[in-house]
């Protein structure tokens, strides 16, 4: 632990002015693991003037950083690049004349305290005023800056010509597109100071290329993947003062695929579990031993979870018998195509031949988490009746 500091497994605090520290505290290689440090408290360190780019990067778990009543004059732009957990920064009563929003733009700070610094009135610190105005909390800080006449003026009154928030405007066609097709988005940005423009495509899977020239830009997305349905694409304008974004949601239409279909499992009901992907929502149809399966309150499709264009559900069977053993085929269909998969189901042996049920499925009714109503397609057809499951419904449940 550096001289003038104390260290624990999760904290470093340096408050002794003598001899004091001249650089940001660093831990010895074989001491505490810097990743476990969550709080650094520095006070009364008049000779600490700079935070360099690599000073803080080892403290990846850092949540609270306090440097008060010290000599801090300069913070490198990328000083906090690796500190994504930072939530509270307190730089009260230092010697900061300027501070860029670039230091903090990637952080989700709940507190940034900058009181008592000799800021110079310029467009560089206008973002702090904007931040203060956006925070409608009553505990706004009393911040000042020095103007050309060396007069202290409240930041709340600061007016700088040609220094405002930018704007972004995304011109998008109807963003419903078929899988495999391509699309181009256009965006224009405006503002003074002139903003930079960039695209935020999140975790877009599809191949994309962007072209930007000053205040105009385009994004070309090619061979669009079904995995990108529901994703948001944003055009962002950013300058010294702040940023603005305009966003659109991508909808991708694609043929269904049955990504999962397995043999029955038993809980509160027997369930043949499946997962189907498709957009628009596929219609589902079950076949039993090659014939259309007529659903009833004893055999029916239930969707448990819908996640974007993915549907997780069950063909639910109440008290099936040997009469329900056989091949079950699921067909999923929409206007872009269809998919089918088949499984063999064995619920119990024929009476007198194979007495026991499958030992993996004990012969009891298990409590389950319930089922949601089926919201995919119409699966009822009255032809080719197949054996219903036990219509006496021994458990007396309502359906």
């Amino acid at each position: 632990c550096p001289t003038s500091c104390k260290c624990s497994a999760s904290r470093i605090w340096c408050s002794d002015p003598s001899p004091g520290i001249v650089a940001f505290p660093r831990l010895e290689p074989n001491s505490v693991d810097p990743e476990n440090i969550t709080e650094i408290f520095i006070a009364n360190q008049k000779r600490l003037e700079i935070i360099n780019e690599d000073d803080v990067e080892a403290y990846v778990g850092l949540r609270n950083l306090t440097i008060v009543d010290s000599g801090l004059k300069f913070v490198a732009h990328k000083a906090f690049l690796k500190n994504s957990n930072l939530q509270h920064i307190n730089f009260t009563r230092n010697k900061l004349t300027s501070l860029s929003r670039k230091h903090f733009r990637h952080l989700d700070l709940s507190e940034l305290i900058l009181v008592g610094n000799p800021f110079t009135c310029s467009c560089d610190i206008m973002w702090i005023k904007t931040l203060q105005e956006a925070k409608s909390s009553p505990d706004t800080q009393d911040l000042y800056c020095l103007n050309e006449s060396s007069k202290n003026i409240p930041l709340a009154n600061l007016q700088i010509p040609n220094c405002g928030l930018p704007s972004a405007n995304l011109a998008a066609p109807n963003l419903t597109v078929e899988e495999g097709k391509s699309i181009t988005l256009s965006c224009s940005v405006a503002g003074d100071p002139v903003p930079n423009m960039y695209w935020d495509v999140g975790n877009l899977v599809s191949k994309h290329m962007n072209e930007t020239s000053h205040t105009q830009g385009s994004l070309r997305i090619t061979n669009i993947s079904s995995d990108d349905s529901g994703k948001q694409i944003s055009c962002v304008a950013e300058n010294l003062v702040g940023e603005d974004q305009d966003s659109v949601n991508l909808t991708v239409h694609f043929a269904p695929t049955i990504t999962f279909l397995e043999s029955p499992t038993s809980d509160h009901h027997w369930c043949i579990p499946f997962t189907v992907k498709g957009n628009p929502k596929p219609a589902l149809q079950w076949f039993y031993n090659g014939a259309i399966l007529n659903e009833s309150k004893y055999i029916c499709t239930k969707i448990h979870v819908t996640n974007h264009t993915e549907y997780h559900g069950c063909l639910q069977l109440d008290n099936p018998t040997h009469m329900n053993n056989g091949d079950y085929t699921l067909i999923a269909k929409n206007e872009y195509g269809k998919d089918e998969k088949q499984i063999s189901a064995h619920f119990m042996g024929w009476p007198g031949i194979d007495d026991g049920a499958n030992p993996n499925y004990p012969d009891v009714i298990y409590e389950d988490y319930g089922t949601a109503a089926n919201d995919i397609g119409d699966t009822t057809n009255r032809s080719n009746e197949i054996p219903s499951t036990d219509v006496t419904d021994k458990t007396g449940r309502e359906h």
């Epitope: 448990h304 979870v305 993915e310």
Partner: antibody, heavy 122, light 107 residues
Framework: EVKLVESGGGLVQPGGSLKLSCAAS????????MSWVRQAPGKGLEWIGE????????NYTPSLKDKFIISRDNAKNTLYLQMSKVRSEDTALYYC???????????????WGQGTLVTVSA | DIQMTQSPASQSASLGESVTITCLAS??????LAWYQQKPGKSPQLLIY???TLADGVPSRFRGSGSGTKFSFKISSLQAEDFVSYYC?????????FGGGTKLEIK
Amino acid sequence: EVKLVESGGGLVQPGGSLKLSCAASGFDFSRYWMSWVRQAPGKGLEWIGEINPDGSTINYTPSLKDKFIISRDNAKNTLYLQMSKVRSEDTALYYCARGNYYGSSLAWFAYWGQGTLVTVSA
Amino acid sequence: DIQMTQSPASQSASLGESVTITCLASQTIGTLLAWYQQKPGKSPQLLIYAATTLADGVPSRFRGSGSGTKFSFKISSLQAEDFVSYYCQQFYSTPYTFGGGTKLEIK
């Protein structure tokens, strides 16, 4: 009846190791995703990680993945949590919980064990 | 990681009243959210999954709503046994995360 019974908890020294077990019965264990969740005394729930039905995919909460290992033995219907390099903040009640039979890990937990207490103290 | 912010941390109410608990996700999670009840000294019990679907055997006075980033959980006509702790949990992506919990206390 679906039953999950954890065991193996107890007092362990800081820096030490411990292996927890969860014995499952009343359902086809080999079909389900399984998770471990812990709860420090008087605190909230924290998901530790999950394992898929055949044990080929294991997901952990990032801060714990270097010290905890989840495994399963489908022949014994048992889920395991190997804990190493434990610290006082690992003191908690450790639950195993049953996930889903779907092909993806839709992890809501319909069934929980009663928990086993791990106390880390010198 | 997706942060789940649950509020309030504690709430007092009287028998027969209604209460609402809110859960905010730090990013959109669709409807992949569950609610649990935990009684002192007991394991959590699933009440609601997929944001709105009541788990089997759960009384209809419990109700879940919401999608995207904002979710609500309402208990109507509070009974004595409802004055315990409640947690939300996202199962949109790993690591699955829980809200900090809400303790319901009797007025």
